[in-house]
């Protein structure tokens, strides 16, 4: 679809005569009829296949034609066509004299024609005007013409329809040849496909408008390149959606079971060495001078009564020092200069000679101790109470005051919260310092294993030969993805070696 445009520029009829030679009275009031038809080697009579147009009276005898409009007529004249421009044409222009206002052919005098010209030739679609001048015996017509495409039509023959749009069906403008030119942010044959945010993951992300990155189920992050771990995953990560691969030191389906209490909680004090001894269980090995479950209690080095023979102990920064009573010497006053003759045994202790009288030993009555029976027995000295229990002397005996959560003569027993079997669904109960903990079987979770969850069917490593295990959370089953060379539901059979069945 396009328009043949004809711009009439100047008409000269100096003598003011008709084609018949008769003069116009008072002058030739001139209007034009234009016929555009398909190319003919000799212009033939017959229909104006490409269209016709008439002008109003444009002037008298000789005149220039204004560019825009004159007397209601348009200049350039428009001859629209709704087919592919063939590149060739025939053009016939007639100048007529109109004595009155009625320009219909039947209303004109029989010899009203002033002049008639015909041209034929090639004409390509384009913006440039072709200038032409046709001269007859008495008249001259100067004009120019061109063919341009109608709105939304493009190409060498105005045959390509392209209408710019910015809606659901496309986002583009049209190039001069009619090809689409996508608006920024759009791509595809019809520019319907948005260009997602730069870096948006090709598979895991998508967009409905440019510079957007919407994540498919199981993915997150600005570029949809981060997987979403299994719902409830506490201390774990994923490489594909809904996985829960535990961080170091954590276990269980949701990686919420602490396997490294030492690292995560640092319970041992005063530089003690911590050893994991099970789930939420640990043992502290204290440095010298400290005691207690968490080595939180500072010990005096004299508390162990290292001085013998009635020596008195003095604490020092780098240890202790024994002040020996007369007759004794040595680091711990362990060497004696006395014999039984010196009556060295106190509190009714009886003396026995040793090494031919070079030494002696005291046999102490009950409740007294020491190399000279100089000390009343302190039954707590050996720190018999376990788990941080406090030792109390009670006359001839002693007792331990236990910390909460411990019992027994020496506080050696945990108070058993597990006695009443609090773990549901066959969970295993563990006594802890401040309570208990349930280790749940596969498929259960919660503090008391009371919550039904998906079984991590892969937890038992059912796949052989380094196959990848995938858990189907909807059916609590596993699927093995076999490496090259292995087959079978667990990838247990090498390819080419049939399984050996027992029958």
């Amino acid at each position: 679809s396009g328009v043949f445009q004809l711009q009439l520029q100047e008409f000269i009829n100096e003598r003011g005569v008709l084609a018949s030679g008769r003069p116009c009275e008072p002058g030739c009031r001139t209007f034009f009829r234009v016929c555009l038809k398909h190319f003919q080697a000799v212009v033939s009579p017959g229909p104006c296949t490409f269209g016709t147009v008439s002008t109003p009276v444009l002037g008298t005898n000789s005149f220039a034609v204004r560019d825009d409009s004159s007397g209601g007529g348009r200049n350039p004249l428009q001859l629209p066509f709704n087919f592919t421009w063939p590149g060739t044409f025939s053009l016939i222009i007639e100048a007529w004299h109109a004595p009155g206002d009625d320009l219909r052919p039947e209303a004109l005098p029989p010899d009203a024609l002033i002049s008639k010209i015909a041209i034929q030739g090639s004409l390509a679609v384009g913006q440039n005007w072709l200038l032409d001048e046709q001269t007859s015996t008495l008249t001259r017509l100067r004009y120019s013409y061109r063919v341009i495409c109608s709105d939304n039509y493009y190409g060498d023959n105005c045959s390509r329809l392209c209408k710019k749009r910015n809606d659901h069906f496309g986002h583009y403008v049209c190039q001069p040849d009619g090809n689409l030119s996508c608006l920024p942010g759009w791509t595809g044959e019809y520019c319907q496909q948005p260009i997602c945010l730069s870096g948006c993951h090709e598979q895991n992300g998508y967009c409905s408008k440019p510079a957007e990155c919407l994540c498919r189920p199981g993915w997150q992050g600005r570029l949809c390149n981060e997987c979403i771990p299994h719902n409830g995953c506490r201390h774990g990560t994923c490489s594909t959606p809904w996985q829960c691969t535990c961080d170091e030191g954590w276990g269980g389906l949701f990686c919420d079971q602490d396997l490294n209490y030492c690292t995560h909680h640092s319970p041992c004090k005063n530089g003690a060495t911590c050893s994991n001894s099970g789930q939420r269980s640990y043992t502290c090995t204290c440095r010298p001078g400290y005691t207690g479950v968490d080595c939180e209690l500072e010990l005096s080095e004299c508390d162990s009564n290292p001085c013998r023979n009635g020596g008195s102990c003095k604490d020092q920064e780098d240890g202790y020092h024994c002040l020996c009573p007369p007759g004794y010497y040595g680091l711990h006053c362990e060497h004696s200069t006395l014999s039984c003759a010196d009556s060295p045994c106190f509190n009714g202790g009886s003396c026995r000679e040793r090494n031919q009288g070079a030494n002696y030993a005291c046999e102490c009555p009950p409740n007294f101790t020491g190399s000279n029976c100089e000390k009343k027995v302190d039954r707590c000295t050996s720190n018999p109470c376990a788990n941080g229990g406090q030792c109390l002397n009670r006359g001839p005996s002693r007792m331990c005051r236990c910390r909460p959560g411990f019992t027994g003569t020496y506080c050696e027993l945990h108070v058993s919260d597990c006695a009443r079997n609090p773990c549901a669904h066959g969970g295993t109960c563990h006594d802890l310092e401040n309570g208990l903990m349930c280790t749940c079987p596969a498929g259960f979770s919660g503090r008391r294993c009371e919550v039904r969850t998906s079984i991590d069917a892969c937890a038992s490593s059912p796949c052989f030969n380094r196959a990848t295990c995938y858990t189907d959370l909807s059916t609590d089953t596993f699927v093995c993805n076999c490496p090259y060379g292995f087959v079978g539901s667990r990838c247990e059979f090498p390819v080419g070696l049939p399984p050996s069945f027992p029958w």
Epitope: S20, H38, P45, P47, T49, F83, P110, D111, L113, S115
Partner: antibody, heavy 119, light 111 residues
Framework: QVQLVQSGAEVKKPGASVKISCKAS????????IHWVKQAPGQGLEWIGY????????NYNQKFKGRVTFTTDTSTSTAYMELRSLRSDDTAVYYC????????????WGQGTLVTVSS | DIVMTQSPDSLAVSLGERATISCRAS??????????MKWFQQKPGQPPKLLIY???NQGSGVPDRFSGSGSGTDFTLTISSLQAEDVAVYYC?????????FGGGTKVEIK
Amino acid sequence: QVQLVQSGAEVKKPGASVKISCKASGYSFTAYYIHWVKQAPGQGLEWIGYIANYNRATNYNQKFKGRVTFTTDTSTSTAYMELRSLRSDDTAVYYCARDYDYDVGMDYWGQGTLVTVSS
Amino acid sequence: DIVMTQSPDSLAVSLGERATISCRASESVDNYGISFMKWFQQKPGQPPKLLIYAASNQGSGVPDRFSGSGSGTDFTLTISSLQAEDVAVYYCQQSKEVPWTFGGGTKVEIK
């Protein structure tokens, strides 16, 4: 009113020439084309060709080319057809008819001229 | 050349009845959506008279009972109610290509 008046009947010997006239009136002769059509006795119509009066361009039926010539005199609004080397099968009524560029077709015809070729 | 074939060669129709004449071209006579087809009526001793141009348009002063239809290669002239003055020979003619050619004619008579 529109009229096309043709010259009278002609009797010619084989090998001779004949020139028929067609005088137009009642319309702008120059704007139109003049066709010539042959009708042999008891036969149908056969198109010979046309002339454009405004620029004297002609278009002939190949069958008659070389023996026929169209001319026009715009000052007298008359068109002519000359047929040469006459043969007996040229015996026919020859019509002129006007035509135009806006496809009304051959809407007005002359009364016809009978040309008899006989030795 | 484009050959125009008319049928029937002759046709006898009662007064007031419909008469239909067909014309077939050896190739399409359409160009740019226009059919370059005309119908003429010729009465004895008279020149032809234009009835229909561009396949379906009536010529000046032609009665409404004459109508034309068709496109491409097949065309029809219809006289809806035959009158006595319609006795004549009817010709189709194409003007798409030089040489312009006529059909052989159909003679219409009163039955």
